[in-house]
């Protein structure tokens, strides 16, 4: 009992004056609280409380459920307690079978005893199964049995509180331990697609998948630089214990251009946070943008190959593609394919393969592509480089020697005189007249050049060389001269 110090308020005194009292079931419990400032008795078991304003607590026929702590409190807030055990051989445990444990924390199996004199108060596995080897516990007859540092592996563990009474083991009702996992890593988040491109009015829907050990993970879709709450729908699954998956789907039923932006799926738990983003671009209508992969003006040597390559962005998907030359559509020699197999790909490649080009195959090659919203085209001007060809070489009536050559690029014609029968001509002769003949003709064909010299300048036997050349190559034609007296005579020209 408390000792009284004069002048200071003292706790109440309880009769019987002991800390613990054992009564048999059916017997009377009579507890007297003596204090001039008595306020109330409080009875507490399994963390539930009852109050009594009488200073004498009387229970005529004690039951096991009357086991518990009886506390008397005075007006100064001072109190004194006695713990009463109501010994009932048929009910050795009072129980609350709700049993939840947080991983790495302690949890109390609430099975206080009604008889403190039983022995070997402990936990046992159900159906004779042993407890996990690492399970440690501390028994307290007035509260229950504390399991220390709950492990994830204990989830759905079936337990009994157990005592030995008169040499026999007695078990309580079953307890099923439900373990709430501790978060030991950030959530794992992923998004159905990293970017979306839509036309105005189309539906935008994106799904974020959040994986964690329990459904307590928090997740939300956020618009970057905005506080507006977005409407989401959820689906969730428990794939066995501690393997939880949530799908958070964000939908904008009719997207507008100003909905474009970055959307973030954010998830956090007590360990930390993770996020993933997706980009939405909404356009008012579809588009096609073509990017030539080579120069649109192409020079290629006669007989060689060339690939005309374009990349293009098309949204929505391209519906028709064609390559055209001289109003004719290619049915083969070209291929069209997506730049990537990615579902969100809008970039495509088209290649026209031109093989062994002839000088007559220069011209405009056009790629046309269309989708449901727009058409687009790009033209390639193909020039076929050809070695000059001497079309004509003649002595004209007026005594001029004329050479006409065709090729691309435009040939240059030089004249040389070779004395005697030598065909190694070095002395150059300036032409009298040079004309490009077909500048008004088709722009991609061979260019024809005509050059003339005055043959009266030659006073000796010899050979005149007409040499046509360009970047690709050269070709020569020859005029042979022989003088008989004062007469000059043209002997056959030859190449």
């Amino acid at each position: 009992q408390p000792s009284v110090s004069p002048g200071e308020p003292s706790p109440p005194s309880i009769h019987p004056g002991k800390s613990d009292l054992i009564v048999r079931v059916g017997d009377e419990i009579r507890l007297l609280c003596t204090d001039p400032g008595f306020v109330k008795w409080t009875f507490e078991i399994l963390d539930e409380t009852n109050e009594n304003k009488q200073n004498e607590w009387i229970t005529e026929k004690a039951e096991a459920t009357n086991t518990g702590k009886y506390t008397c409190t005075n007006k100064h807030g001072l109190s004194n307690s006695i713990y009463v055990f109501v010994r009932d051989p048929a009910k050795l445990f009072l129980v609350d079978r709700s049993l939840y444990g947080k991983e790495d924390n302690d949890t109390l199996v609430r099975c206080p005893l009604t008889d403190p004199e039983v022995t070997n108060y402990s936990l046992k596995g159900c159906q004779g199964k042993p407890l996990p080897k690492d399970l440690r516990f501390i028994p307290d007859p007035k509260a229950g049995i504390m399991i220390k540092s709950v492990k994830r592996a204990y989830h759905r563990l079936c337990l009994h509180c157990s005592v030995d009474q008169e040499g026999k083991s007695v078990l309580s009702e079953k307890f099923i331990l439900k373990v709430r996992p501790a978060f030991k890593a950030v959530p794992v988040v992923s998004v159905s697609k990293a970017s979306y491109l839509l036309r105005e009015g189309e539906e935008f829907t994106v799904t974020c998948t959040i994986k964690d050990v329990s459904s307590s993970v928090y997740s939300t879709w956020k618009r970057e630089n905005s506080q507006t709450k977005l409407q989401e729908k959820y689906n969730s699954w428990h794939h066995g214990d501690f393997n939880y998956e949530r799908q958070a789907t964000l939908t904008i039923s009719s997207a507008r251009v100003n909905d474009s932006g970055v959307f973030m799926c954010y998830a956090n738990n007590t360990f930390g946070s993770a996020n993933v983003t997706t980009t939405l671009e909404v356009v008012d209508k579809g588009f096609i943008n073509i990017f030539p992969m080579i120069n649109t003006t192409v020079f290629v040597n006669d007989g060689e190959n060339v690939d005309l390559i374009v990349e293009y962005e098309a949204f929505p998907k391209p519906e028709h593609q064609q390559w055209i030359y001289m109003n004719r559509t290619f049915t083969d020699k070209w291929e069209d394919y997506p730049k990537s197999e990615n579902e969100s790909n809008i970039r495509y490649v088209s290649e026209l393969h031109l093989t062994r080009l002839k000088g007559t195959e220069g011209g405009t090659y056009t790629f046309l592509v269309s989708n449901s919203d727009v058409n687009a085209a790009i033209a390639f001007n193909v020039y076929v480089n050809t070695k000059p060809e001497i079309l004509t070489y003649d002595r004209l009536v007026n005594g001029m020697l004329q050479c006409v050559a065709a090729g691309f690029p435009e040939p240059t014609i030089d004249w040389y005189f070779c004395p005697g029968t030598e065909q190694r001509c070095s002395a150059s002769v300036l032409p009298v007249d040079v004309q490009t003949l077909n500048s008004s003709g088709p722009p991609f064909g061979k260019l024809v050049v005509q050059s003339s010299i005055d043959s009266s300048a030659f006073k000796h036997n010899g050979t005149v060389e007409c040499k046509a050349y360009n970047d690709v190559g050269k070709t020569s034609a020859y005029f042979n001269f022989a003088f008989k007296g004062n007469n000059k005579e043209q002997i056959h020209p030859h190449t």
Epitope: V95, S98, K102
Partner: antibody, heavy 117, light 111 residues
Framework: QVQLVQSGAEVKKPGASVKVSCKAS????????MHWVRQAPGQGLEWMGV????????SYNQKFQGRVTITADKSTSTAYMELSSLRSEDTAVYYC??????????WGQGTLVTVSS | DIVMTQSPDSLAVSLGERATINCRAS??????????MHWYQQKPGQPPKLLIY???NLESGVPDRFSGSGSGTDFTLTISSLQAEDVAVYYC?????????FGGGTKVEIK
Amino acid sequence: QVQLVQSGAEVKKPGASVKVSCKASGYTFTSYNMHWVRQAPGQGLEWMGVIYSGNGDTSYNQKFQGRVTITADKSTSTAYMELSSLRSEDTAVYYCARERDTRFGNWGQGTLVTVSS
Amino acid sequence: DIVMTQSPDSLAVSLGERATINCRASESVDIYGQSFMHWYQQKPGQPPKLLIYLASNLESGVPDRFSGSGSGTDFTLTISSLQAEDVAVYYCQQNNEDPYTFGGGTKVEIK
């Protein structure tokens, strides 16, 4: 004797939030899990979530994920349920319920929340 | 989520007659033979009241005309002799797995 006393009826506009309280007595507040259940007019019961005894961990019905927050004030033995972004279909009676020996042994009297523009 | 399906939706029984309500879970609510299944009674304007816990245990203060049975996925609430004060809606509930779920309710009336 255990008692759960809830706060009074509320009328809210769509988009607003509501916070319902549940004051507990007759037991050690921190020793028991507190659940929240709602019931729309003429409908059945729907579990919303729980705040666990001891450390205040929570678990929510995914239907309300991101909108519901359950908290507790140990000093006043009061549990709270806040529901945000209210819509008309959130009009319901909201109950707190104490879990005892695996079942919902004690219920609050209910709080009617009406969501109307 | 475990789906709880109650049948029938409503039931009209004469006073003194037996009323039987069934509840089926979409998956077992048992652990080690313990059924985490409870029955509640709700009268208009009142909160639910616990009748039966862990499938077959009668809550303190509930008349013994109420009884519960079943395990695994199939459960039954029986009122052996219907009284006027038993007119109410009855709900089953599982708390084996989060989220805890309720049946849709069965309305019991007097024929």
